[in-house]
Interface confidence: medium
């Protein structure tokens, strides 16, 4: 029986019924409930929340809701031996110490188990030495220091400002530069928007606020001790020395009050240009070491955190499909937070909760989706996407055969200006069509569609009259589904105005001040932006699970493949002489893209014309659409990154948060002029072009007529 026969309701009515059932007031209530105490991964509080969500999803009407547990490597500060940084004089006396905790926000003074700021997975150590200021600690910042300024970071403690790139990349870069410790701090230039008060009077970061976060370089591995396989009861675990992605030097985060004390004494070289200056009243000298009067003083780190194998719990809910129960559409977001999780993740978890409630209401009225919908509340995302990755490792065979799509649901807001969507090109048309049907919540756009306000506020840089949609990078739970398994994925949230607000993320990210009140007072008092995000995420899941033909347009992949090929060719053409010397040609890639474009066009024509009442042909066409994303997976993975297997997209090697197109070719070309063996380096470029061209051609052939 089809889902529509089961209810005698038209598909359009079902979608309307689903969307109409979503209520801002419920999201608000759920957010409040999820944010009253900390829910740090591996703690009893987070286990209790998992059980609460399991119970409520069952009440909402899902067919089954199970806990999936894993024993993974986590990291915690030592409760009796706190982490801090000091300035020491020549006698070794500590003349300044950084704060041991953030001053708690009003109303939370008596809350226990607030984890103090720390860099998760930092090794223990007490290095001391001269300080070097390394700006954002990006690849290009170290190039500037080492190549242009001839400053050697070897044996130094580096201080870097948060922002621009994932903190794990900063630590990796510092390690490669020979540093013996890293201090991370939030500069007001990046975390204090002009004209806004600091919390609790506004949404800016106070001087005592600190960003927590993991500093791993997992490259998609999941649990550091069980890469590739689930961390279950009978798992074989690597020794800590063989663990994946752990940093080798101590790392600690601080706020800008403490950073001021370290940076104001800096001597040595002046900053190379204005892009190295933040907003503190300090010279932003690079060092090494302190200036004149303070030249005998050093910086000392005291880090005593421990890595511990700890049990984590995912909640997995199932709403069985009526027609294609073996096809899975997944909506997942994490539950664990650093402290209260007012935005990250509970603004997302509250939206998922309301989406589950709405689907459950329809199910209780006799409706079922065409395909199975899986709902997930992931654990230990903050410790390296561990819950989602372990579950996907455990279920990889099912997922690679049955996974239609994954929609991510972390923070629903990072601002309140306009929509932000990152997704596979297969979902562009789905997102466009859906947002044309939804009302904009934005002031000045009353009665207008979400598509209209989004396009006006965030226009595509390429296509007039269309909104910007970005590439998927990483740093969130879609990673394993998209980058490793090749399941079409997308994410949506409300964002800030990127033109006027240059600060990184939102100011209170991963601090103790990320509370319910932050959201309710300053970001979304009416919860109208949360509701819109619920409609977008929920609407995408609904369409993916219920449309007779999957709402994927392969022609949009053809368009971006051409753009990405143009881009990578243009990068390579910065080296015309070497291209000639080593006979480097992109002809095979452009040819494959041309073939893909033609075959995708023909497939789309067949998709319009085929007999949709023939279930075998329908299933065949849908399978070609479902498996197209899978066809971009190279089983061997990218060089030195075996769990990043998507040939078209991978997280940037220089910033995990950003997506890179044709990453294999891009990395082979990166800084190629500095390679010791140019012949070998250009040989690798040629190999990567070959892999990319083959993959695009092979993917195209999956869309050809089957016989």
């Amino acid at each position: 029986k089809s889902s529509n026969e089961a209810t005698n309701i038209t598909p359009k009515h079902n979608m309307k019924a689903f969307l109409d059932e979503l209520k801002a007031e419920n999201i608000k209530k759920f957010l409040y409930n999820f944010t009253q105490i900390p829910h740090l991964a591996g703690t009893e509080q987070n286990f209790q929340l998992a059980k609460q969500i399991q119970s409520q999803w069952k009440e909402f009407g899902l067919d089954s809701v199970e806990l999936a547990h894993y024993d993974v490597l986590l990291s915690y500060p030592n409760k009796t031996h706190p982490n801090y940084i000091s300035i020491i004089n020549e006698d070794g006396n500590e003349i300044f110490n950084t704060s041991l905790f953030e001053p708690p926000p009003p109303g939370y003074e008596n809350v226990s188990d607030i984890v103090p700021p720390f860099s998760a997975f930092s090794p223990q150590g007490m290095p001391e030495g001269d300080l070097v200021y390394v700006n954002y600690a990006r690849t290009e910042d170290f190039f500037k220091l080492e190549r242009d300024m001839k400053i050697n970071c070897s044996g130094k403690i580096v201080i870097a400002r948060y922002g621009k790139v994932f903190r794990g990349n900063k630590v990796k870069n510092a390690q490669l530069a020979g540093a013996k410790g890293v201090i991370l701090y939030s500069d007001p230039a990046d975390y204090f928007a002009p004209g806004v008060k600091s919390y609790p009077d506004g949404w800016n970061l106070p001087g005592g606020g600190v960003q927590r976060g993991n500093i791993l370089n997992l490259n998609g591995a999941g649990d550091p001790l069980t890469p590739g396989y689930p961390a279950n009861e009978y798992a074989y675990r690597r020794g800590i020395a063989e663990a994946v992605g752990l940093p080798s030097i101590p790392v600690h985060p601080i706020g800008y009050y403490d950073a001021q004390k370290l940076l104001e004494k800096m001597g040595g070289s002046a900053p190379p240009d204005s892009s190295w200056r933040g907003s503190l009243k300090v010279p932003y000298n690079v060092g090494p070491g302190f200036t004149g009067n303070f030249s005998t003083q050093k910086v000392k780190m005291h880090i005593h955190s421990t890595n511990e194998v700890t049990r984590i719990y995912n909640v997995i809910g199932t709403l069985r499909g009526a027609v294609e129960p073996d096809r899975y559409v997944i909506l997942g977001g994490h539950r664990d937070s650093w402290v209260f999780g007012g935005i990250d993740p509970q603004s997302g978890a509250a939206v998922v909760h309301e989406i589950v409630r709405s689907f459950g209401t329809l199910k209780k009225e006799g409706w079922r989706p065409r395909r199975t919908i899986l709902f997930a509340s992931w654990d230990a995302e903050e410790f390296g996407l561990l819950g989602s990755t372990e579950w996907a490792e455990e279920n990889s065979r099912l997922l690679q055969e049955r996974g239609v799509a994954y929609i991510n649901a972390d923070s629903s807001i990072e601002g309140n200006y306009t929509l932000r969507v990152d997704c596979t090109p297969l979902m562009y048309s789905l997102v466009h069509n859906l947002t044309k049907e939804l009302k904009s919540p934005d002031e000045g756009f009353e009665g207008k569609s979400l598509y209209e306000s989004w396009t006006k506020k965030s226009p595509s840089p390429e296509f007039s009259g269309m909104p910007r949609i970005s590439k998927l990078g990483s740093g969130n739970d879609f990673e394993v589904f998209f980058q490793r398994l090749g399941i079409a994925s997308g994410r949506a949230r409300y964002t800030k105005n990127w033109e006027t607000n240059k600060f990184s993320g939102y100011p209170l990210y991963h601090s103790v001040y990320e509370t319910y009140e932050l959201v309710e007072k300053f970001y979304d008092p009416m919860f109208k932006y949360h509701l819109t995000v619920a409609q977008v995420r929920g609407g995408m899941v609904f369409e993916l699970a219920n449309s007779i033909v999957l709402p994927f347009d392969c022609r949009d992949y053809a368009v971006v493949l051409r753009k990405y090929a143009d881009k990578i060719y243009s990068i390579s053409m910065k080296h015309p002489q070497e291209m000639k010397t080593y006979s480097v040609s992109f002809d095979s890639l452009f040819s494959a893209v041309k073939n893909f474009t033609e075959i995708a066009s023909k497939f789309s024509e067949r998709l319009q014309d085929f007999d949709k009442s023939n279930p075998i042909v329908l299933r065949m066409m849908n399978d070609q659409l479902m498996f197209l994303e899978r066809a971009f997976i190279d089983p061997l993975g990218l060089p030195d990154r075996p769990f990043y297997r998507h040939v078209i997209y991978a997280p940037s090697s220089h910033n995990k948060y950003a997506g890179e197109s044709f990453p294999g070719i891009y990395d082979a070309l990166f800084d190629i002029e500095s390679k010791v063996d140019p012949s070998k380096a250009w040989g690798e470029v040629k190999r990567q072009i070959y892999v990319a061209a083959f993959t695009v051609q092979a993917a195209a052939e999956t869309l050809s007529e089957v016989a």
């Epitope: 621009k164 932000r420 840089p461 390429e462 910007r468 970005s470 590439k471 964002t495 990127w498 033109e499 143009d566 881009k567 990578i568 243009s570 990068i571 950003a658 997506g659 197109s661």
Partner: nanobody
């Protein structure tokens, strides 16, 4: 750090041609993956996209302005230019040059230059 600076006359007579140049410093204009664009903002209004030139040379214009606008690039000088003919008082605005790309952090804008169309 890439910076953009607009230059050109602040006053243009009606029916004449508005000419602006954007000088890019701190990075190459032929850098792959970027779109070099012109936008304008009328007093009290939203930004209006005029057009852009993609790193591979393709040029796209706002359809409502297409008949009056030419965007060109001079890679040797690391500059790109805007010419808008048959201007009227309705073209009075602050004109900005900008760099854009596929991702959110790619957006950069110059400080803007006020162009008044008046006789």
């Amino acid at each position: 750090q890439v910076q953009l600076q607009e230059s050109g006359p602040g006053l243009v007579k009606p029916s004449q041609t508005l000419s602006l140049t954007c000088t890019v410093s701190g990075g190459s204009i032929s850098n792959s993956g970027y779109y070099w664009s012109w936008v304008r903002q009328h007093p009290g209004k939203d930004l209006e996209w005029i057009g852009f030139i993609y790193y591979n040379g393709s040029i796209h214009y706002n359809p409502s302005l297409k008949s009056r606008v030419i965007i060109s690039v001079d890679t040797s000088k690391n500059q790109f230019s805007l010419k808008m003919n048959s201007v009227t008082a309705a073209d009075t605005a602050v004109y900005y040059c900008a760099r854009d790309g596929d991702d959110y952090g790619d957006y950069l804008r110059g400080q803007g230059t006020l162009v008044t169309v008046s006789s």
